[in-house]
């Protein structure tokens, strides 16, 4: 469900959702819109200033690192 998350609670949420992948506060370049002029939206804009669906949090997780080959 939609929820408002700010400050330490937002960090706790991102840490738990993303786990060992880590996270970004702003979506990495190349996410979503291809327009270079489009303002970069961040998790604070999406989930603190407004309420966001919990699934949005996953959008800010870093990509899974490929397993290292021996």
């Amino acid at each position: 469900g939609p929820e408002t998350l700010c400050g330490a609670e937002l960090v706790d949420a991102l840490q738990f959702v993303c786990g060992d992948r880590g996270f970004y506060f702003n979506k990495p370049t190349g996410y979503g819109s291809s327009s270079r002029r489009a303002p970069q939206t961040g998790i604070v804009d999406e989930c603190c200033f407004r309420s966001c669906d919990l699934r949005r949090l996953e959008m800010y997780c870093a990509p899974l690192k490929p397993a290292k080959s021996a």
């Epitope: 929820e3 949420a13 738990f16 959702v17 786990g19 060992d20 699934r55």
Partner: antibody
Framework: QVQLVQSGVEVKKPGASVKVPCKAS????????MHWVRQAPGQGLEWMGI????????SYAQKFQGRVTMTRDTSTSTVYMELSSLRSEDTAVYYC??????????????WGQGTTVTVSS | DIQMTQSPATLSLSPGERATLSCRAS??????LAWYQQKPGQPPRLLVS???NRATGIPARFSGSGSGTDFKLTINSLEPEDSAVYYC???????????FGGGTKVEIK
């Protein structure tokens, strides 16, 4: 169908560790969080902690901090709960329980059948 | 940490009667509360989520109500198979966590 399968019985000596598995099937393993809850004989339910099978992150009850470790193996859809420095008071039934966290609904909707851990010298 | 207190500890009623079980949180938990039924030798079964939403397959005689700090589980027209221990559980969002109440034992005379 959706199910969580746990091992049956574990007998351990005081000071030892126990690692309890919980194998999930019938759903997407990484889409649901997993709790561990224990119940001592004749007592109520006690929450121990939770693991996110996708990222591997954990949150533990303060009482168990430093003694409990929850891990997962996504290749076998199994979560594990390891409890160290066992004492007689840890004798209990240990349950894993699924949480449909992303739906926003509160509640553990699927439970394992429980693993009985007996700590005795 | 939030404490959950259930009352009464035991409730002894006859078939067909109404059971009202209470659960009180030490601080406001909104509607982040679930109820479970547990019979001897079995794992708990989810009855109600979000304080008032009956879980899949749960008979309509079970209903949950309340928000904030005071919650109730009502069992209308008790049946012999409702003899069990009932637990409430609060959910903390971030980092995720949970607390159970001490339970209410419902006995059918």
């Amino acid at each position: 169908q959706v199910q969580l399968v746990q091992s049956g019985v574990e007998v351990k000596k005081p000071g030892a560790s126990v690692k309890v598995p919980c194998k999930a099937s019938g759903y997407t393993f990484t889409s649901y969080y997993m709790h561990w809850v224990r119940q001592a004989p004749g007592q109520g339910l006690e929450w121990m902690g939770i693991i996110n099978p996708s990222g591997g992150s954990t949150s533990y009850a303060q009482k168990f901090q430093g003694r409990v470790t929850m891990t997962r193996d996504t290749s076998t859809s199994t979560v594990y709960m390891e409890l160290s420095s066992l004492r007689s008071e840890d004798t209990a039934v240990y349950y894993c329980a699924r949480d449909d966290f992303w739906s926003g609904a509160v509640g553990m909707d699927v439970w394992g059948q429980g693993t009985t851990v007996t700590v005795s010298s | 940490d939030i404490q959950m207190t259930q009352s009464p500890a035991t409730l002894s009623l006859s078939p067909g009667e109404r059971a009202t079980l209470s659960c009180r949180a030490s601080q406001d938990v909104g509607s982040d509360l679930a109820w479970y039924q547990q019979k001897p030798g079995q794992p708990p079964r989810l009855l109600v989520s979000d304080a008032s939403n009956r879980a899949t397959g749960i008979p309509a005689r079970f209903s949950g109500s309340g928000s904030g700090t005071d919650f109730k589980l009502t069992i209308n027209s008790l049946e012999p198979e409702d003899s069990a221990v009932y637990y409430c559980q609060q959910r903390r969002r971030w980092p995720p966590g949970a607390t159970f109440g001490g339970g209410t034992k419902v006995e059918i005379k």
